[in-house]
């Protein structure tokens, strides 16, 4: 589907994550780790860290790949949405955020990607081995989803082989190129896995002082559109029910959701007033039938309807009113 | 790769409904949505709707609502237009396409008595 | 509906020249713009996507740019197997549409 691998830079890891190995030898084994674990899912990727300085406090990056234009975002934890999982958080760069407790801030880092918070106390806080998805929607290409999780807090993502669980069945094309090199790396990376083994693991000391936690590049459109490849933070999957539904979610569903545009108008960057309201801007919409996009708003049974949106200032606006619904 | 078979050419008479296919290769749709596109003889496309196949959401052009009905069959990966009501003006190729990347190669549809 | 004008509807060209062909939005579409070639037998392939991306296999002398509301699908140098029949399609605003297509002939 692409044509060249467009990796960005990968700055190394916190310096509370260098250990034993020390700096150096520790990034090419993140380097290469990170590639093992996202090189089938060229079209979807997922960040997920601990904030150093709120060590119950996590942050989850997401962003999209693929081409289409992104007409919804839908974040879970404890599994894919619509199977097992449990949504967080539902971005629609028209109707606005909506988010679920423990969920403390969902926003729109770029027109591809984004961001959440999670709160780190309470009985729906998240566990540190809890895995979170990320399902983009994209008009009129498709829908993709991909999960990650933290490494296991005792091991800056060295101790183990990754068993990621990506949901995304993207076309392998465009990564072609570099397999080569990535089963090389791999098979460096496991070499390098057995020869840790027999050191004392490095522990995870959070520094208060340390500069944030390297970000992925701030993809503009076109550039999100001609990576092949991008490489997030390795991420481990291990798996950790949330708290019940009840309490992760006290707020009603998103009723708003029951019926869904398939598609989202451009969206240029800069602050907007979004249209929140169902009548299109003009009449040239087309219906959305059987809730094209309701498992995103699928909540627990005992929730009701009615949501008011926020919409993220910092976010993608559309060019025009939502889609009519029937 | 996603790789789309559509049915073969269809001859009908004006009032009928005919219903063609697009099996999806391999098992799997990839996550695309099964988009429908007109093309009369020699003119340009015109986009008719959008199935997603993971849960049989449509996505209609007004124009074509009350004329096609999309759906889909997950056990075989196969997606389905049914077009009604047919006159001439429905004779043309119609195209299935997985997103707008992978395209089928196209079933005719003929109208005449 | 967002109309999609497309110039020129023909165009013919000797191998090896540089072409551009252009569809011009009838509104903001942003970069949601992609380039599809369609072959005598009816065969569609996309070529580029969100405006100026390239899709995997498609040969380096295709590419796309924008200028304002102006989009344009060039060919560095034509080889023979590319004259045949290209289309735009805007999908910023539901429905996508379409341009209405030029017909790449050899001089």
């Known amino acids: 589907m692409r044509t060249e691998a467009q990796v960005p830079a990968l700055q190394p890891p916190e310096p509370g994550l260098e250990g034993a190995m020390g700096h150096r030898t520790l990034v090419l084994p993140w380097v290469l780790l990170t590639l093992c674990v996202t090189a089938g899912t060229p079209e979807v990727w997922v960040q997920v860290r601990m904030e150093a300085t709120e060590l119950s406090s996590f942050t989850i990056r997401c962003g999209f790949l693929g081409s289409g234009s992104i007409s919804l975002v839908t974040v879970s934890w404890g599994g894919p949405n619509g199977a097992g999982g449990t949504t967080l958080a539902v971005l629609h760069p028209e109707r606005g955020i909506r988010q679920w407790a423990p969920a403390r801030q969902a926003r729109w880092e770029t027109q591809s990607s984004i961001s959440l918070i999670l709160e780190g106390s309470g009985a729906s806080s998240p566990c540190a081995n809890t895995t979170f998805c990320c399902k983009f929607a994209s008009f009129p290409e498709g829908s993709w989803e991909a999960c990650g999780s933290l490494p296991p807090s005792s091991d800056p993502g060295l101790s183990a082989p990754p068993t990621p669980a990506p949901i995304l069945r993207a076309d392998l094309a465009g990564i072609l190129g570099v397999s080569g090199v990535l089963l090389f790396g791999c098979v460096y990376l496991l070499h390098l896995l057995r020869r840790h083994k027999h050191r004392p693991a490095p522990r995870l000391q959070p520094s208060r002082t340390s500069p944030q936690a390297p970000r992925a590049r701030a993809w503009a459109p076109s550039q999100a559109s001609q990576a092949a490849l991008h490489v997030p933070y390795a991420t481990i999957n291990t798996s950790c029910r949330p708290a019940t539904l009840d309490t992760a979610h006290p707020h009603g569903g998103p009723s708003w959701w029951a019926s869904l545009p398939t598609h989202a108008a451009h969206r240029p960057q800069g602050p907007a007033a979004w249209a929140s309201t169902p009548i299109p801007a003009r009449g040239s919409f087309v219906s959305v039938e059987n809730g094209l996009y309701a498992q995103a708003g699928e909540r627990p049974p005992h929730t009701g309807p009615g949501l008011t949106l926020f919409p993220d200032p910092r976010g993608p606006r559309a060019m025009e009113g939502p889609l009519g619904v029937r | 790769e996603v790789q789309l078979q559509q049915s073969g050419p269809v001859l009908v008479k004006p009032g009928a409904s005919v219903k063609m296919s697009c099996k999806a290769s391999?098992?799997?749709?990839?996550?695309?949505?099964i988009n429908w596109v007109k093309q009369r003889h020699g003119k340009s496309l015109e986009w008719i709707g959008l199935?997603?196949?993971?849960?049989?959401?449509?996505n209609y052009n007004q124009k074509f609502k009350d004329k096609a009905t999309l759906t889909v069959d997950k056990s075989s990966t196969t997606a389905y237009m049914e077009f009604n009501s047919l006159t001439s003006d429905d004779s043309s190729v119609y195209y299935c396409?997985?997103?707008?990347?992978?395209w089928g190669q196209g079933t005719t549809l003929t109208v005449s008595s | 509906d967002i109309q999609m004008t497309q110039s020129p509807s023909s165009l013919s060209a000797s191998l090896g020249e540089r072409v551009s062909l252009t569809c011009r939005a009838s509104?903001?579409?942003?970069?949601?713009l992609n380039w599809l070639q369609q072959e005598p037998d009816g065969t569609i392939k996309r070529l580029i996507y969100a405006t100026s991306s390239l899709d995997s296999g498609v040969p380096k002398r295709f590419s796309g740019s924008r200028s304002g509301s102006d989009y344009s699908l060039t060919i560095s140098s034509l080889e023979s197997e590319d004259f045949v029949d290209y289309y735009c399609?805007?999908?910023?605003?539901?429905?996508?549409?379409f341009g209405g297509g030029t017909k790449l002939e050899i001089k």
């Open positions: 509104q903001d579409i942003g970069n949601n």
């Open positions: 396409a997985g997103g707008t990347v992978y």
């Open positions: 199935i997603d196949p993971s849960n049989g959401g449509t």
């Open positions: 391999g098992n799997t749709f990839n996550g695309y949505y």
């Open positions: 399609l805007q999908y910023a605003s539901s429905p996508p549409t």
